[in-house]
């Protein structure tokens, strides 16, 4: 089949790297400079990504493969293959529409990217507050306020057994 | 094909101004939100100053009420008037066009311009 598809369509022998230049009888040229062609049997070569401002050049494009990008310090990417840069901001702040501001009071962030988080609300777990939470750090929930009681067991009761007969509420 | 060309930087004193232009040619400038960022020697790029295609502004807290933005639909152009200079904005300026509309990102298919210099010492 692959003699038969060559026959047929000479433009299926040119390999990676090259195109199929209809101007010069169907022969394979190379790719032109600042362009790539990833596999075989290509009409044309695709233009070369251009790492340009905040994106900064990771893998530069050969005749066989495009450019890749990062983000120059001070931004990180997102998006599939760093489509898009994002501004750092520090710990304890968020980006916004007026740039990089503090996280308000009640919330966190511990990373330079993303967004202020709420403290963890430990009363929820029935535990209380054993750090206090900063712009840049969570609170740390410690034992229930009944645990840290005078005389408090730490060790757990049993269960009361049920009585035949009762199905568990 | 799409050209940012900026202009106007220079050398000038603490306290004084300078105004910056970005020509743009090759796409559809009155439709476009535009911007500036900087990166000073041996540090990190930092976003400046945006303008939506409707002429709204936002700014780094940095140059609020030093620097201002604003755009000639007419001309092409986006420029950048900075007063009360000091020495903590010497950098390089660069304009480029900012199609996510997020500020301080950035998108691969945005344009950029090869930066103008600004000093800003005694």
């Known amino acids: 089949f692959e003699r038969t598809r060559s026959l047929q369509d000479p433009c299926s022998n040119c390999p990676a790297g090259t195109f199929c230049d209809n101007n010069r009888n169907q022969i394979c040229s190379p790719c032109p400079p600042n362009s790539f062609s990833s596999a075989g049997g290509q009409r044309t070569c695709d233009i070369c990504r251009q790492c340009k401002g905040v994106f900064r050049t990771r893998k530069e494009c050969s005749s066989t493969s495009n450019a890749e990008c990062d983000c120059t310090p001070g931004f990180h990417c997102l998006g599939a293959g760093c489509s898009m840069c994002e501004q750092d901001c520090k710990q304890g702040q968020e980006l916004t529409k007026k740039g990089c501001k503090d996280c308000c009071f009640g919330t966190f962030n511990d990373q330079k990217r993303g967004i202020c988080r709420p403290w963890t609300n430990c009363s929820l777990d029935g535990k209380s507050v054993l750090v206090n939470g900063t712009k840049e750090r969570d609170v740390v929930c410690g034992p229930s306020p009944a645990d840290l009681s005078p005389g408090a067991s730490s060790v757990t009761p049993p269960a009361p057994a049920r009585e035949p007969g009762h199905s568990p509420q | 094909e799409v050209d940012l060309v900026e202009s106007g930087g220079g050398l000038v004193q603490p306290g004084g101004s300078l105004r910056l232009s970005c020509a743009v040619s090759g796409f559809t400038f009155s439709n476009s939100a535009m911007s500036w960022a900087r990166q000073a020697p041996g540090k990190e790029f930092e976003w400046v100053s945006s303008?939506?295609?409707?002429?709204?502004?936002y700014y780094v807290d940095s140059v609020k009420g030093r620097f201002t933005i604003s755009r000639d639909n007419a001309k092409n152009t986006v420029y950048l008037q900075m007063s009360s200079l000091k020495p903590e904005d010497t950098a390089v300026y660069y304009c480029?066009?900012?199609?996510?509309?997020?500020?301080?990102?950035?998108?691969?298919?945005?344009?950029w311009g090869q930066g103008t210099q600004v000093t800003v010492s005694s």
């Open positions: 303008i939506y295609s409707d002429g709204k502004t």
């Open positions: 480029a066009t900012w199609k996510t509309l997020r500020v301080g990102v950035w998108d691969e298919s945005d344009y």
